[in-house]
Interface confidence: low
Amino acid sequence: VGSGMGTGQRAGSPAAGPPLQPREPLSYSRLQRKSLAVDFVVPSLFRVYARDLLLPPSSSELKAGRPEARGSLALDCAPLLRLLGPAPGVSWTAGSPAPAEARTLSRVLKGGSVRKLRRAKQLVLELGEEAILEGCVGPPGEAAVGLLQFNLSELFSWWIRQGEGRLRIRLMPEKKASEVGREGRLSAAIRASQPRLLFQIFGTGHSSLESPTNMPSPSPDYFTWNLTWIMKDSFPFLSHRSRYGLECSFDFPCELEYSPPLHDLRNQSWSWRRIPSEEASQMDLLDGPGAERSKEMPRGSFLLLNTSADSKHTILSPWMRSSSEHCTLAVSVHRHLQPSGRYIAQLLPHNEAAREILLMPTPGKHGWTVLQGRIGRPDNPFRVALEYISSGNRSLSAVDFFALKNCSEGTSPGSKMALQSSFTCWNGTVLQLGQACDFHQDCAQGEDESQMCRKLPVGFYCNFEDGFCGWTQGTLSPHTPQWQVRTLKDARFQDHQDHALLLSTTDVPASESATVTSATFPAPIKSSPCELRMSWLIRGVLRGNVSLVLVENKTGKEQGRMVWHVAAYEGLSLWQWMVLPLLDVSDRFWLQMVAWWGQGSRAIVAFDNISISLDCYLTISGEDKILQNTA
């Protein structure tokens, strides 16, 4: 995206502005720049499953009836415009909300090219002041918009059909020399604008659609379906430094907040102030001879705090997440400078009360002390506040670094990206994807149970109308009881005239068992809200039990676990609906219905309308587990 000008030099800003800030280093380190980015990573498995489940090979369908794919990256304009401040040609001030009709308007900027993505294995979108103006404000006289979008349709369509590997899109502040802290502020504004990746795959009928939101009213022979995904951070406020830990030695601007704010040139009655050690050695800050003074000061810059009587000053970390018990706050303070004050650290978890962190002092060299506090692994994202409470007429304190260390264990604990999926009905009603293809009509015209579901691979969506749908039995002798697919044509089953998977447990002298095994299903996406749905019925007296076993193919070894069980049942001849969460399934798997019965058993066991939720393969929860408060 185009390179924007520095905010201090934007056309139309007053000539006599504040003095120019010192420049920040031209090249942030790779890690620092990385930490300013918002990364969207769509796993390769999503592409594989979307292709297998939704996109049949091109030869099997007419060109006109082929599903289409679209994509975009959207950001709310308001936080981005607030960063720029009032600008000429903006019809509403950045501080106030956009007018209602403008909020849904969006301006679309060109995204990246397939060529770039193929070459770099990732698409980097740089967002600067000019792009914000172009995308959110536009030419003078045009209404301001509420949404800035990058068009990624070409790219997503190529990736989903022909691409390989994962799709990685990095959104980051445009890199250029400007005033101190610009990239950090731009990064914060980008995160506040809740960037989200939008994908859409929709099936078309006999004519290609212009717009997926402008569907023609469907006729009975017209088939269409529309799936949408939004990938966004489950905690958009979460600092991306969270992935790498936070280490701030005050040599460069940090992602910390200060209260009262960090000193600037216009505010001479400073509290927090970033000063280089050379300057400290020239200032009359410490008692004792100059030689000692320079020896005590660390190299580089540090924070100096000048406080009046009984005041409170705070340094606040960005939002973080920890995946390690060993996550620790470490702060280096100068102990001789603050005899009349004390430091307190607070853990501020999201949606929970604040609590104090036990600070353990470790004396260091030349009067510096490292205060360490164990943070551990709070369930929720958190911030850490370091408060200096002075108690005396005047107090001086120095901080050399502020770090959150060892907060990640194994995979990055950074922001958790969720890929939320939905199914849009013809009338505009939006369902969760899990509601599609579950044998319950949720759309007014039933399109959520339509052709898309019947085209899923064998076993995913089975009402046994076309046979066993991949369910098989071992080699059977003529006298072995068998599972069968047939109708329940019987006066007692007026409500269920279609086919089902049945087993008759007729009276036998010795115990009997019968097993039927499903087709094999791929491994669900990690942390997807995966479910198995089915209806079941037992009519008559079952002297025995029926189990549903999930078998995982773990590195060649088969591991079975019972996921459902019913025993010694006197059936009511009523169909019952069952939804089973398939948790912690990490390998390909299949299902087995195992019935066992003994003497005196005269029951019919029936299963029908079996479906594996599309969520298993096309949805990613932002959280590995449900958030809960800890004591």
Partner: antibody
Framework: ALQLQQSGAELVRPGASVTLSCKAS????????MHWVKQTPVHGLEWIGA????????AYNQKFEGKAILTADKSSSTAYMELRSLTSEDSPVYYC?????????????WGQGTTLTVSS | DVQMIQTPSSLSASLGDRVTISCRAS??????LNWYQQKPDGTVKLLIY???RLHSGVPSRFSGSGSGTEYSLTISNLEQEDIATYFC?????????FGGGTKLEI
């Protein structure tokens, strides 16, 4: 079973020092802080301080700075508290108690207590 | 330091009674309030943490409630084994501080 076993009762002279011990078993010693609490009829329960056995870091209640010194030996899963310059004020029961590092403000298991008598 | 005021300092009740002990903090402690039981032999056990959560192995007749600065412990159906002194403790700010205790007699 999880246990915090404290050393037996002590009788010491005023001005002397004493070291109380608390041996942990049934859990990973370095996964929990060890806290020490004093109980007197006058002041009730008072928090003395805590040690992080993993790092050896300590934190003290200002009231007990200089009075108590906390240490821990990872190899024997034992926490120690040395009490210095003893007076009759230091004569009650001392408890060790463990606390989870994060997400918890409670002491979930306590030792049985050690009675200290300071008398000439 | 946060002051914890516990009331009453002692109370007498009959078996089967419902008993409530109160604890007031000198400032908002954000639900970081724990209750302990000290038996006559000196043994101390955690009963309730984070205002209302029962520690493992504690009978369900014990319950806790409250918010801000006001908290309470309730024993719904008093049993002989509940004869003890009960303490509240705040864990919101350092140093952790305890209430003066409530001696429960049958």
């Amino acid at each position: 079973a999880l246990q915090l076993q404290q050393s037996g009762a002590e009788l010491v002279r005023p001005g002397a020092s004493v070291t109380l011990s608390c041996k942990a078993s049934g859990y990973t010693f370095t996964d929990y802080e060890m806290h020490w609490v004093k109980q007197t009829p006058v002041h009730g329960l008072e928090w003395i301080g805590a040690i992080d056995p993993e790092t050896g870091g300590t934190a003290y209640n200002q009231k007990f700075e200089g009075k108590a010194i906390l240490t821990a030996d990872k190899s024997s899963s034992t926490a120690y508290m040395e009490l210095r310059s003893l007076t009759s004020e230091d004569s009650p029961v001392y408890y060790c108690a463990r606390r989870r590092y994060y997400g918890s403000s409670s002491f979930d298991y306590w030792g049985q207590g050690t009675t200290l008598t300071v008398s000439s | 330091d946060v002051q914890m005021i516990q009331t009453p300092s002692s109370l007498s009740a009959s078996l089967g009674d419902r008993v409530t002990i109160s604890c007031r903090a000198s400032q908002d402690i954000g639900n970081y309030l724990n209750w302990y039981q000290q038996k006559p032999d000196g043994t101390v056990k955690l009963l309730i943490y984070y205002t209302s959560r029962l520690h493992s192995g504690v009978p369900s007749r014990f319950s806790g409630s409250g918010s801000g600065t006001e908290y309470s412990l309730t024993i719904s159906n008093l049993e002989q084994e509940d004869i003890a002194t009960y303490f509240c403790q705040q864990g919101s700010a350092l140093p952790p501080t305890f209430g003066g205790g409530t001696k429960l007699e049958i």
